[in-house]
Interface confidence: medium
């Protein structure tokens, strides 16, 4: 790719595409990023991340006016984390019940852990190209949060947009709408 | 330099099928879009829609849904336009079309040399 | 759709003369990216359009620098300072900010 012609994506949340009919990949295919948990040989105060899942993502992606050549392959962090003492009887009463409503006031949710940065080249309906620099996630973990954190911020640790590379008079400016897309 | 070389004049009777190609040269050609124009006589022009060359994926203009299919062959570096069920509203001057490397929506710098599609009884 | 309206449909020219085409789109032509995708293309008779005018007002590598254009939001101008008698055809606005990408109808100019 052009490094002077690569423009940032500020989110790679963008309109999902449907794969090419000759394409064998997955979509969407979760799995529990190899999280296990056992009601065996640990003590009480041993806690197992239950919930957190990755699901693993394939998708073209389109900007609206262009559409990557190849599908993108990255993780979506979703669902709640359920950090729980391990004990038989950990799904209903019990210690169980007492445990959580001690620390109602704290959620454990499923956050991106590791991401990096690739460059996707995409072809566009004017028969010209464009190459984008986005942010995908490459791991998943459960972290910790009050229930004062303001609850609709869930981009927890997600990069920060860097700023956008200017080139050839192409003058860029994030948009309201650039959280999900750039058209 | 950039070419692309399309296929000669058709005449069609109505109901039957026309398939157009399209051959690029000059560039790598899946690494960019193929676009589609349609020019009836006397007439503006009209995009059609492109097909991601890499991936295959067509896209259409809502007007250009149903009877037009857009395809590749890759080894060859031809795309193609099939137009089936032919009416007479189909007869125009069909042209592949592709845009500047890097540099999106900065015009159509390339065309094809358009094919004559006549839909006659 | 954006359905991009131009004006005049004819347009007799003095040779050295100046000439002007407007063109105005149905809605804003300014990508959320700051960029305006409003492009001129000439085509001269039997022949495919070429490319003129890209993003309002950059010119394509090759153009004379007769040839302008101006404009923002919904109103654009391609203007040509001196008509020479190769610039006769059909010129072409179009617009690539919104899909589908669309086309004017078309403004014929011709030598008086």
């Known amino acids: 790719f052009k490094n002077d012609a690569t423009e940032i994506l500020y989110s790679h949340v963008v309109k999902p595409v449907p794969a090419h009919p000759s394409s064998n990949s997955t979509l969407n295919q979760a799995r529990n990023g190899g999280r296990h948990f056992s009601n065996t040989g640990l003590d009480r105060n041993t806690r197992v991340q239950v919930g957190c899942r990755e699901l693993r993502s394939t998708k073209y992606i389109s900007d609206g006016q262009c559409t990557s050549i190849s599908p993108l392959k990255e993780l979506v962090c979703a669902g709640e984390c359920l950090p729980l003492p391990v004990l038989p009887n950990w799904i209903g009463g019990g210690y169980g019940t007492k445990y959580w409503s001690r620390r109602s006031s704290q959620e454990w949710r499923c956050v991106n852990d590791k991401t990096r940065t690739q460059r996707i080249q995409l072809q566009c309906q004017d028969g010209s190209t464009r190459t984008y620099k986005i942010t995908v996630v490459t791991a998943c973990k459960c972290k910790r949060y009050t229930r004062q954190h303001n609850e609709s911020s869930h981009n927890f640790e997600s990069m920060s947009p860097a700023k956008p590379v200017q080139h050839h008079r192409e003058r860029k400016r994030a948009s309201k709408s650039s959280k999900h897309s750039m058209s | 330099q950039v070419q692309l070389v399309q296929s000669g004049a058709e005449v069609k009777k109505p109901g039957a099928s026309v398939k157009v190609s399209c051959k690029a040269s000059g560039y790598t050609f899946t690494t960019y879009g193929m676009s589609w124009v349609k020019q009836a006589p006397g007439q503006g022009l009209e995009w059609m829609g492109w097909i991601n060359t890499y991936s295959g994926v067509p896209t259409y203009a809502d007007d250009f849904k149903g009877r037009f299919v857009f395809s590749l062959d890759t080894s060859v570096s031809t795309a193609y336009l099939q137009i089936n069920s032919l009416k007479a509203e189909d007869t125009a001057v069909y042209f592949c079309v592709r845009g500047r490397e890097y540099y999106y929506g900065s015009g159509i710098a390339f065309w094809g040399q358009g094919t004559l599609v006549t839909v006659s009884s | 759709d954006v359905v991009m309206t131009q004006s005049p449909l004819s347009l007799p020219v003095t040779l050295g003369q100046p000439a002007s085409i407007s063109c105005r789109s149905s809605?804003?032509?300014?990508?959320?990216?700051?960029?305006?995708?409003l492009h001129w293309y000439l085509q001269k008779p039997g022949q495919s359009p070429q490319l003129l005018i890209y993003?309002?007002?950059n010119r394509f590598s090759g153009v004379p620098d007769r040839f302008s254009g101006s404009g923002s939001g919904t109103d654009f101008t391609l203007k040509i300072s001196r008509v020479e008698a190769e610039d006769v055809g059909v010129y072409f606005c179009?617009?690539?900010?919104?899909?589908?990408?669309?086309f004017g109808g078309g403004t014929k100019v011709e030598i008086k």
């Open positions: 179009s617009q690539s900010t919104h899909v589908p990408l669309t």
């Open positions: 993003k309002v007002s």
């Open positions: 809605q804003s032509l300014e990508h959320s990216n700051g960029n305006t995708y």
